[in-house]
Protein backbone atom coordinates (compact mmCIF):
# COMPACT_ATOMS: atom_id res chain seq x y z
CA UNK A 1 0.00 0.00 0.00
CA UNK A 2 1.41 3.40 -0.96
CA UNK A 3 -0.15 6.47 0.58
CA UNK A 4 0.87 9.71 -1.03
CA UNK A 5 0.29 13.23 0.16
CA UNK A 6 -0.09 16.55 -1.59
CA UNK A 7 2.43 19.11 -2.63
CA UNK A 8 3.27 22.03 -0.32
CA UNK A 9 1.70 25.39 -1.07
CA UNK A 10 -1.79 23.97 -1.26
CA UNK A 11 -3.75 21.65 1.01
CA UNK A 12 -2.74 18.05 0.51
CA UNK A 13 -5.06 15.12 0.04
CA UNK A 14 -4.36 11.45 0.67
CA UNK A 15 -4.02 9.21 -2.39
CA UNK A 16 -3.67 5.44 -1.95
CA UNK A 17 -2.54 2.88 -4.52
CA UNK A 18 -2.08 -0.89 -4.46
CA UNK A 19 0.72 -2.65 -6.33
CA UNK A 20 -0.73 -5.24 -8.66
CA UNK A 21 -0.07 -7.60 -11.54
CA UNK A 22 -1.54 -7.79 -15.02
CA UNK A 23 -2.14 -10.91 -17.07
CA UNK A 24 -0.94 -10.21 -20.63
CA UNK A 25 -3.65 -10.24 -23.27
CA UNK A 26 -6.33 -9.71 -20.64
CA UNK A 27 -7.70 -6.62 -18.90
CA UNK A 28 -6.03 -5.24 -15.77
CA UNK A 29 -6.83 -2.80 -12.99
CA UNK A 30 -4.47 -0.20 -11.53
CA UNK A 31 -5.97 0.66 -8.14
CA UNK A 32 -6.06 4.19 -6.75
CA UNK A 33 -8.33 5.88 -4.23
CA UNK A 34 -8.43 9.43 -2.87
CA UNK A 35 -10.33 11.64 -0.45
CA UNK A 36 -13.55 12.34 -2.36
CA UNK A 37 -14.86 15.73 -3.39
CA UNK A 38 -18.51 16.74 -3.50
CA UNK A 39 -18.28 18.15 -7.02
CA UNK A 40 -17.24 15.91 -9.95
CA UNK A 41 -16.28 18.91 -12.07
CA UNK A 42 -13.59 19.83 -9.50
CA UNK A 43 -11.81 16.46 -9.74
CA UNK A 44 -8.84 15.88 -12.03
CA UNK A 45 -7.28 12.42 -12.33
CA UNK A 46 -3.99 11.95 -14.14
CA UNK A 47 -2.29 8.60 -14.61
CA UNK A 48 1.37 8.78 -15.65
CA UNK A 49 3.95 6.10 -16.32
CA UNK A 50 7.65 6.46 -15.65
CA UNK A 51 9.58 6.67 -18.93
CA UNK A 52 6.50 7.37 -21.05
CA UNK A 53 6.12 10.82 -22.60
CA UNK A 54 2.36 10.94 -22.97
CA UNK A 55 -0.24 10.53 -20.28
CA UNK A 56 -1.65 7.11 -19.55
CA UNK A 57 -5.07 8.65 -18.90
CA UNK A 58 -6.64 11.94 -17.86
CA UNK A 59 -10.12 12.56 -16.48
CA UNK A 60 -11.31 16.09 -15.82
CA UNK A 61 -14.56 18.06 -15.68
CA UNK A 62 -16.47 14.79 -15.47
CA UNK A 63 -15.12 13.20 -18.63
CA UNK A 64 -12.04 11.69 -20.29
CA UNK A 65 -9.54 14.18 -21.70
CA UNK A 66 -7.26 12.14 -23.93
CA UNK A 67 -5.53 14.73 -26.11
CA UNK A 68 -2.18 14.16 -24.37
CA UNK A 69 -2.51 10.38 -24.04
CA UNK A 70 0.47 8.32 -25.10
CA UNK A 71 0.08 6.30 -28.31
CA UNK A 72 0.58 2.98 -26.51
CA UNK A 73 -2.47 3.59 -24.30
CA UNK A 74 -4.93 4.88 -26.91
CA UNK A 75 -8.19 2.96 -26.85
CA UNK A 76 -7.00 0.91 -23.87
CA UNK A 77 -7.84 2.89 -20.75
CA UNK A 78 -10.89 3.92 -18.76
CA UNK A 79 -11.67 5.14 -15.27
CA UNK A 80 -14.82 4.04 -13.48
CA UNK A 81 -16.54 7.36 -14.17
CA UNK A 82 -19.50 6.76 -11.88
CA UNK A 83 -17.18 5.96 -8.96
CA UNK A 84 -14.87 8.98 -9.24
CA UNK A 85 -17.19 11.07 -7.08
CA UNK A 86 -16.71 8.60 -4.18
CA UNK A 87 -12.92 8.69 -4.49
CA UNK A 88 -12.17 5.83 -6.88
CA UNK A 89 -9.52 6.79 -9.45
CA UNK A 90 -8.68 3.21 -10.44
CA UNK A 91 -7.78 2.65 -14.07
CA UNK A 92 -8.95 -0.18 -16.25
CA UNK A 93 -6.38 -1.25 -18.83
CA UNK A 94 -7.38 -3.33 -21.84
CA UNK A 95 -5.13 -5.95 -23.46
CA UNK A 96 -2.26 -5.86 -20.94
CA UNK A 97 1.20 -6.03 -22.54
CA UNK A 98 4.57 -7.04 -21.09
CA UNK A 99 5.68 -3.47 -21.80
CA UNK A 100 2.98 -2.12 -19.46
CA UNK A 101 5.10 -3.17 -16.47
CA UNK A 102 6.64 -0.32 -14.52
CA UNK A 103 6.01 2.52 -12.10
CA UNK A 104 2.75 4.45 -12.45
CA UNK A 105 1.71 7.64 -10.69
CA UNK A 106 -1.89 8.37 -9.76
CA UNK A 107 -2.11 12.16 -9.46
CA UNK A 108 -5.26 13.78 -8.11
CA UNK A 109 -6.45 17.39 -7.93
CA UNK A 110 -9.66 18.30 -6.09
CA UNK A 111 -11.03 21.48 -4.51
CA UNK A 112 -9.42 20.29 -1.25
CA UNK A 113 -5.93 20.07 -2.71
CA UNK A 114 -3.52 17.82 -4.60
CA UNK A 115 -1.97 14.44 -3.95
CA UNK A 116 -0.28 11.53 -5.68
CA UNK A 117 0.97 8.01 -5.08
CA UNK A 118 3.08 5.59 -7.07
CA UNK A 119 2.14 2.06 -8.02
CA UNK A 120 4.37 -0.79 -9.15
CA UNK A 121 2.71 -2.80 -11.90
CA UNK A 122 4.07 -6.18 -12.89
CA UNK A 123 3.04 -8.01 -16.03
CA UNK A 124 3.25 -11.62 -17.03
CA UNK A 125 1.00 -14.57 -17.67
CA UNK A 126 -0.55 -16.91 -15.17
CA UNK A 127 -3.34 -19.45 -15.33
CA UNK A 128 -5.03 -22.12 -13.29
CA UNK A 129 -3.53 -25.62 -13.52
CA UNK A 130 -5.65 -28.68 -14.08
CA UNK A 131 -4.49 -32.05 -12.82
CA UNK A 132 -5.79 -35.22 -14.42
CA UNK A 133 -5.06 -38.93 -14.34
CA UNK A 134 -3.19 -39.92 -17.48
CA UNK A 135 -4.85 -43.16 -18.48
CA UNK A 136 -2.63 -43.52 -21.56
CA UNK A 137 0.49 -44.02 -19.47
CA UNK A 138 1.82 -47.49 -18.62
CA UNK A 139 1.89 -46.77 -14.88
CA UNK A 140 -0.34 -44.62 -12.65
CA UNK A 141 0.50 -41.13 -13.86
CA UNK A 142 -0.79 -37.60 -13.19
CA UNK A 143 -0.66 -34.82 -15.74
CA UNK A 144 -0.71 -31.17 -14.67
CA UNK A 145 -1.43 -28.59 -17.40
CA UNK A 146 -1.64 -24.81 -17.31
CA UNK A 147 -2.18 -22.99 -20.61
CA UNK A 148 -0.42 -19.62 -20.13
CA UNK A 149 2.60 -18.64 -18.03
CA UNK A 150 5.34 -16.04 -18.32
CA UNK A 151 8.08 -15.70 -17.20
CA UNK A 152 8.90 -19.41 -17.12
CA UNK A 153 7.70 -20.77 -13.79
CA UNK A 154 8.97 -23.49 -11.52
CA UNK A 155 6.83 -26.60 -11.04
CA UNK A 156 6.91 -28.60 -7.81
CA UNK A 157 4.87 -31.66 -6.92
CA UNK A 158 3.83 -32.50 -3.36
CA UNK A 159 1.67 -35.12 -1.73
CA UNK A 160 -0.37 -35.27 1.46
CA UNK A 161 0.87 -38.71 2.41
CA UNK A 162 4.57 -38.16 1.63
CA UNK A 163 4.94 -34.65 3.04
CA UNK A 164 8.37 -33.19 2.36
CA UNK A 165 9.14 -35.78 -0.33
CA UNK A 166 11.11 -34.65 -3.38
CA UNK A 167 9.30 -35.69 -6.55
CA UNK A 168 11.77 -34.22 -9.02
CA UNK A 169 13.15 -37.66 -9.87
CA UNK A 170 9.71 -39.05 -10.72
CA UNK A 171 8.33 -36.05 -12.57
CA UNK A 172 8.97 -34.43 -15.93
CA UNK A 173 8.09 -30.82 -16.79
CA UNK A 174 8.00 -29.23 -20.24
CA UNK A 175 7.28 -25.71 -21.48
CA UNK A 176 5.73 -25.20 -24.90
CA UNK A 177 5.71 -21.74 -26.48
CA UNK A 178 2.22 -20.54 -27.39
CA UNK A 179 1.37 -19.13 -30.80
CA UNK A 180 1.92 -15.48 -29.80
CA UNK A 181 5.56 -16.39 -28.96
CA UNK A 182 5.53 -14.98 -25.45
CA UNK A 183 3.54 -17.13 -23.08
CA UNK A 184 4.09 -20.84 -22.59
CA UNK A 185 1.98 -23.86 -21.87
CA UNK A 186 3.19 -25.75 -18.80
CA UNK A 187 2.90 -29.54 -18.73
CA UNK A 188 4.21 -31.59 -15.84
CA UNK A 189 3.86 -35.35 -15.50
CA UNK A 190 4.18 -37.23 -12.20
CA UNK A 191 4.88 -40.97 -12.34
CA UNK A 192 4.38 -43.85 -9.89
CA UNK A 193 1.33 -42.34 -8.26
CA UNK A 194 -0.29 -44.23 -5.40
CA UNK A 195 -4.01 -44.42 -4.80
CA UNK A 196 -5.80 -42.83 -1.81
CA UNK A 197 -3.51 -39.84 -1.80
CA UNK A 198 -3.82 -36.13 -2.57
CA UNK A 199 -1.23 -34.69 -4.94
CA UNK A 200 -0.54 -31.02 -5.55
CA UNK A 201 1.04 -29.46 -8.63
CA UNK A 202 2.44 -26.03 -7.67
CA UNK A 203 3.37 -23.57 -10.42
CA UNK A 204 5.08 -20.34 -9.46
CA UNK A 205 6.86 -17.37 -10.98
CA UNK A 206 7.59 -13.91 -9.56
CA UNK A 207 4.04 -12.76 -10.29
CA UNK A 208 1.74 -15.60 -9.32
CA UNK A 209 1.52 -18.94 -7.57
CA UNK A 210 -1.06 -21.51 -8.64
CA UNK A 211 -1.87 -24.91 -7.22
CA UNK A 212 -3.83 -27.78 -8.69
CA UNK A 213 -4.82 -30.57 -6.30
CA UNK A 214 -6.12 -34.01 -7.15
CA UNK A 215 -7.33 -36.68 -4.78
CA UNK A 216 -7.48 -40.13 -6.28
CA UNK A 217 -9.39 -42.89 -4.52
CA UNK A 218 -10.70 -46.18 -5.88
CA UNK A 219 -14.20 -44.77 -6.17
CA UNK A 220 -13.67 -41.14 -7.25
CA UNK A 221 -11.37 -38.33 -8.32
CA UNK A 222 -11.62 -34.89 -6.70
CA UNK A 223 -9.92 -31.79 -8.11
CA UNK A 224 -9.32 -28.30 -6.77
CA UNK A 225 -7.34 -25.33 -8.09
CA UNK A 226 -6.45 -21.89 -6.85
CA UNK A 227 -4.29 -18.99 -7.94
CA UNK A 228 -2.69 -16.24 -5.89
CA UNK A 229 -0.97 -13.07 -7.06
CA UNK A 230 2.28 -12.55 -5.19
CA UNK A 231 2.86 -8.82 -5.24
CA UNK A 232 -0.35 -7.10 -4.17
CA UNK A 233 1.13 -4.56 -1.77
CA UNK A 234 -0.72 -1.35 -1.01
CA UNK A 235 0.96 2.07 -0.97
Amino acid sequence: LIIGFGISGRHSITVTTVASAGNIGEDGILSCTFEPDIKLSDIVIQWLKEGVLGLVHEFKEGKDELSEQDEMFRGRTAVFADQVIVGNASLRLKNVQLTDAGTYKCYIITSKGKGNANLEYKTGAFSMPEVNVDYNASSETLRCEAPRWFPQPTVVWASQVDQGANFSEVSNTSFELNSENVTMKVVSVLYNVTINNTYSCMIENDIAKATGDIKVTESEIKRRSHLQLLNSKAS
Partner: antibody, heavy 123, light 112 residues
Framework: EVQLVQSGAEVKKPGSSVKVSCKAS????????MQWVRQAPGQGLEWMGA????????RYTQKFKGRVTLTADKSTSTAYMELSSLRSEDTAVYYC????????????????WGQGTLVTVSS | DIVMTQSPDSLAVSLGERATINCKSS????????????LAWYQQKPGQPPKVLIY???SRESGVPDRFSGSGSGTDFTLTISSLQAEDVAVYYC????????FGGGTKVEIK
Protein backbone atom coordinates in the same frame (compact mmCIF):
# COMPACT_ATOMS: atom_id res chain seq x y z
CA GLU B 1 -2.48 -13.64 -41.88
CA VAL B 2 -5.12 -11.13 -40.78
CA GLN B 3 -8.34 -11.45 -42.78
CA LEU B 4 -11.67 -9.64 -42.56
CA VAL B 5 -14.45 -11.20 -44.62
CA GLN B 6 -17.73 -9.33 -44.91
CA SER B 7 -21.25 -10.49 -45.74
CA GLY B 8 -22.77 -10.06 -49.20
CA ALA B 9 -24.60 -7.17 -50.82
CA GLU B 10 -28.04 -6.17 -49.50
CA VAL B 11 -31.02 -4.33 -50.97
CA LYS B 12 -33.27 -2.73 -48.36
CA LYS B 13 -36.44 -0.66 -48.23
CA PRO B 14 -36.43 2.81 -46.65
CA GLY B 15 -37.26 2.67 -42.95
CA SER B 16 -35.94 -0.87 -42.54
CA SER B 17 -32.68 -2.05 -40.95
CA VAL B 18 -29.58 -3.79 -42.26
CA LYS B 19 -27.04 -5.91 -40.41
CA VAL B 20 -23.61 -6.35 -41.98
CA SER B 21 -21.19 -8.96 -40.65
CA CYS B 22 -17.40 -9.02 -40.61
CA LYS B 23 -15.69 -12.32 -39.80
CA ALA B 24 -12.14 -11.95 -38.51
CA SER B 25 -9.34 -14.50 -38.64
CA UNK B 26 -5.57 -14.63 -38.22
CA UNK B 27 -5.44 -12.72 -34.91
CA UNK B 28 -6.95 -12.57 -31.42
CA UNK B 29 -10.35 -11.04 -32.18
CA UNK B 30 -11.05 -9.90 -28.62
CA UNK B 31 -8.03 -7.62 -28.22
CA UNK B 32 -8.39 -5.33 -31.25
CA UNK B 33 -10.86 -2.55 -31.95
CA MET B 34 -13.00 -3.18 -35.01
CA GLN B 35 -13.76 -0.03 -36.98
CA TRP B 36 -16.63 0.63 -39.37
CA VAL B 37 -16.34 3.03 -42.30
CA ARG B 38 -18.79 3.71 -45.10
CA GLN B 39 -18.51 5.18 -48.59
CA ALA B 40 -21.47 6.41 -50.63
CA PRO B 41 -21.16 5.94 -54.43
CA GLY B 42 -18.58 8.37 -55.81
CA GLN B 43 -18.17 9.95 -52.38
CA GLY B 44 -15.52 10.00 -49.67
CA LEU B 45 -14.90 7.83 -46.62
CA GLU B 46 -16.93 8.32 -43.45
CA TRP B 47 -16.03 6.77 -40.09
CA MET B 48 -19.08 5.45 -38.26
CA GLY B 49 -17.86 3.86 -35.06
CA ALA B 50 -15.85 1.10 -33.45
CA UNK B 51 -16.26 -1.82 -31.04
CA UNK B 52 -13.80 -3.56 -28.74
CA UNK B 53 -14.96 -7.20 -28.81
CA UNK B 54 -13.22 -8.09 -25.54
CA UNK B 55 -15.72 -6.14 -23.44
CA UNK B 56 -18.21 -4.73 -25.94
CA UNK B 57 -16.98 -1.15 -25.45
CA UNK B 58 -18.18 1.07 -28.32
CA ARG B 59 -17.47 4.49 -29.78
CA TYR B 60 -19.75 6.22 -32.28
CA THR B 61 -19.53 9.38 -34.30
CA GLN B 62 -22.27 11.85 -33.36
CA LYS B 63 -23.98 11.54 -36.75
CA PHE B 64 -24.79 7.85 -36.26
CA LYS B 65 -25.48 7.73 -32.52
CA GLY B 66 -28.85 6.09 -31.90
CA ARG B 67 -29.11 4.71 -35.44
CA VAL B 68 -26.11 2.40 -35.59
CA THR B 69 -25.49 -0.54 -33.26
CA LEU B 70 -22.14 -2.34 -33.18
CA THR B 71 -21.93 -5.81 -31.67
CA ALA B 72 -19.43 -8.65 -31.62
CA ASP B 73 -19.73 -12.41 -31.20
CA LYS B 74 -16.55 -13.69 -29.56
CA SER B 75 -17.43 -17.34 -30.21
CA THR B 76 -17.37 -16.84 -33.98
CA SER B 77 -14.93 -13.89 -34.14
CA THR B 78 -17.54 -11.88 -35.99
CA ALA B 79 -18.36 -8.19 -35.69
CA TYR B 80 -21.72 -6.76 -36.75
CA MET B 81 -22.90 -3.32 -37.80
CA GLU B 82 -26.65 -2.72 -37.74
CA LEU B 83 -28.04 0.48 -39.22
CA SER B 84 -31.71 1.27 -38.63
CA SER B 85 -34.27 3.70 -40.12
CA LEU B 86 -32.58 3.39 -43.50
CA ARG B 87 -32.94 6.16 -46.06
CA SER B 88 -31.74 6.45 -49.66
CA GLU B 89 -28.64 8.40 -48.60
CA ASP B 90 -27.48 5.35 -46.62
CA THR B 91 -26.77 3.60 -49.92
CA ALA B 92 -23.05 2.93 -49.61
CA VAL B 93 -20.28 0.38 -49.36
CA TYR B 94 -19.74 -0.46 -45.68
CA TYR B 95 -16.27 -1.53 -44.59
CA CYS B 96 -14.94 -3.07 -41.42
CA UNK B 97 -11.30 -2.34 -40.64
CA UNK B 98 -8.70 -3.10 -37.98
CA UNK B 99 -5.80 -1.00 -36.77
CA UNK B 100 -2.16 -1.95 -36.75
CA UNK B 101 -0.96 -3.04 -33.31
CA UNK B 102 1.18 -0.50 -31.49
CA UNK B 103 2.34 -1.68 -28.04
CA UNK B 104 -1.05 -3.23 -27.35
CA UNK B 105 -3.06 -0.33 -28.76
CA UNK B 106 -5.16 -0.91 -31.87
CA UNK B 107 -6.71 2.58 -31.81
CA UNK B 108 -4.30 3.42 -34.61
CA UNK B 109 -4.16 3.67 -38.40
CA UNK B 110 -6.36 1.17 -40.30
CA UNK B 111 -4.00 -1.43 -41.73
CA UNK B 112 -6.51 -4.20 -42.50
CA TRP B 113 -9.83 -3.84 -44.32
CA GLY B 114 -12.73 -6.08 -45.29
CA GLN B 115 -13.70 -6.26 -48.95
CA GLY B 116 -16.75 -4.06 -48.36
CA THR B 117 -20.50 -4.70 -48.40
CA LEU B 118 -22.75 -2.75 -50.74
CA VAL B 119 -26.04 -1.76 -49.11
CA THR B 120 -28.62 -0.31 -51.49
CA VAL B 121 -31.64 1.47 -50.03
CA SER B 122 -34.43 1.74 -52.55
CA SER B 123 -38.21 1.66 -52.57
CA ASP C 1 -16.13 17.22 -34.39
CA ILE C 2 -12.80 17.86 -36.09
CA VAL C 3 -13.25 18.85 -39.74
CA MET C 4 -10.63 17.78 -42.29
CA THR C 5 -10.33 19.83 -45.48
CA GLN C 6 -8.32 18.51 -48.43
CA SER C 7 -7.06 20.47 -51.42
CA PRO C 8 -7.15 20.29 -54.34
CA ASP C 9 -10.22 18.13 -55.10
CA SER C 10 -8.37 16.71 -58.11
CA LEU C 11 -4.88 16.89 -59.50
CA ALA C 12 -3.41 15.99 -62.90
CA VAL C 13 0.34 15.35 -62.91
CA SER C 14 2.70 14.08 -65.60
CA LEU C 15 4.40 10.72 -65.07
CA GLY C 16 7.64 11.19 -63.14
CA GLU C 17 6.54 14.59 -61.81
CA ARG C 18 5.80 15.56 -58.22
CA ALA C 19 2.27 15.49 -56.82
CA THR C 20 1.39 17.43 -53.67
CA ILE C 21 -1.85 17.07 -51.69
CA ASN C 22 -2.76 19.27 -48.74
CA CYS C 23 -4.87 18.58 -45.71
CA LYS C 24 -5.98 21.09 -43.09
CA SER C 25 -7.65 20.25 -39.77
CA SER C 26 -10.05 22.51 -37.86
CA UNK C 27 -7.96 22.07 -34.71
CA UNK C 28 -4.43 20.98 -33.88
CA UNK C 29 -3.77 17.23 -34.13
CA UNK C 30 -0.52 17.51 -32.17
CA UNK C 31 -0.04 15.66 -28.90
CA UNK C 32 2.03 18.25 -27.00
CA UNK C 33 3.65 15.58 -24.82
CA UNK C 34 4.67 13.00 -27.42
CA UNK C 35 5.08 15.55 -30.26
CA UNK C 36 3.19 13.25 -32.61
CA UNK C 37 0.46 14.53 -34.92
CA UNK C 38 -2.43 12.12 -35.29
CA LEU C 39 -2.83 12.21 -39.04
CA ALA C 40 -2.78 9.35 -41.55
CA TRP C 41 -2.92 9.22 -45.35
CA TYR C 42 -4.76 6.55 -47.35
CA GLN C 43 -4.78 5.59 -51.01
CA GLN C 44 -7.91 4.12 -52.60
CA LYS C 45 -8.10 2.62 -56.07
CA PRO C 46 -11.46 1.94 -57.79
CA GLY C 47 -13.30 -1.07 -56.42
CA GLN C 48 -10.80 -1.59 -53.60
CA PRO C 49 -10.73 -0.74 -49.90
CA PRO C 50 -8.34 2.03 -48.84
CA LYS C 51 -4.69 1.31 -48.09
CA VAL C 52 -2.73 3.18 -45.43
CA LEU C 53 0.39 4.97 -46.67
CA ILE C 54 1.45 7.29 -43.84
CA TYR C 55 0.65 7.49 -40.12
CA UNK C 56 1.61 10.03 -37.43
CA UNK C 57 1.87 12.58 -40.25
CA UNK C 58 5.24 11.40 -41.53
CA SER C 59 5.83 7.70 -40.71
CA ARG C 60 5.63 5.43 -43.75
CA GLU C 61 3.70 2.17 -43.38
CA SER C 62 5.79 -0.92 -44.11
CA GLY C 63 5.80 -1.91 -47.78
CA VAL C 64 4.89 1.58 -49.00
CA PRO C 65 7.29 2.90 -51.69
CA ASP C 66 9.57 5.71 -50.50
CA ARG C 67 8.27 8.06 -53.21
CA PHE C 68 5.38 8.64 -50.79
CA SER C 69 6.15 11.01 -47.95
CA GLY C 70 4.15 12.94 -45.40
CA SER C 71 4.97 16.18 -43.65
CA GLY C 72 3.40 18.80 -41.45
CA SER C 73 2.37 19.23 -37.84
CA GLY C 74 -0.50 20.75 -35.88
CA THR C 75 -3.16 21.72 -38.41
CA ASP C 76 -1.41 21.68 -41.82
CA PHE C 77 -0.25 18.50 -43.54
CA THR C 78 1.06 17.47 -46.94
CA LEU C 79 1.30 14.18 -48.82
CA THR C 80 3.96 14.22 -51.53
CA ILE C 81 4.45 11.69 -54.32
CA SER C 82 7.96 12.57 -55.48
CA SER C 83 7.76 10.89 -58.89
CA LEU C 84 4.28 9.89 -60.01
CA GLN C 85 3.91 6.37 -61.39
CA ALA C 86 0.96 5.01 -63.38
CA GLU C 87 -0.06 2.80 -60.44
CA ASP C 88 -0.41 5.88 -58.20
CA VAL C 89 -3.61 6.96 -59.96
CA ALA C 90 -6.12 6.85 -57.11
CA VAL C 91 -8.05 8.93 -54.60
CA TYR C 92 -6.06 9.99 -51.54
CA TYR C 93 -7.61 10.69 -48.14
CA CYS C 94 -6.24 12.20 -44.95
CA UNK C 95 -7.68 11.04 -41.63
CA UNK C 96 -7.34 12.44 -38.13
CA UNK C 97 -7.28 10.23 -35.02
CA UNK C 98 -6.77 12.98 -32.44
CA UNK C 99 -10.41 12.76 -31.35
CA UNK C 100 -12.16 9.66 -32.66
CA UNK C 101 -11.68 9.61 -36.47
CA UNK C 102 -12.56 11.92 -39.36
CA PHE C 103 -11.58 11.61 -43.02
CA GLY C 104 -10.90 14.44 -45.43
CA GLY C 105 -13.01 14.70 -48.59
CA GLY C 106 -10.40 13.10 -50.83
CA THR C 107 -8.15 14.20 -53.68
CA LYS C 108 -8.28 12.44 -57.05
CA VAL C 109 -4.85 12.06 -58.67
CA GLU C 110 -4.75 11.51 -62.43
CA ILE C 111 -2.07 11.46 -65.11
CA LYS C 112 -1.74 14.57 -67.27
Amino acid sequence: EVQLVQSGAEVKKPGSSVKVSCKASGYTFTTYWMQWVRQAPGQGLEWMGAIYPGDGDTRYTQKFKGRVTLTADKSTSTAYMELSSLRSEDTAVYYCARGRDYSGSSWTWFAYWGQGTLVTVSS
Amino acid sequence: DIVMTQSPDSLAVSLGERATINCKSSQSLLNSRTRKSYLAWYQQKPGQPPKVLIYWASSRESGVPDRFSGSGSGTDFTLTISSLQAEDVAVYYCKQSYNLYTFGGGTKVEIK
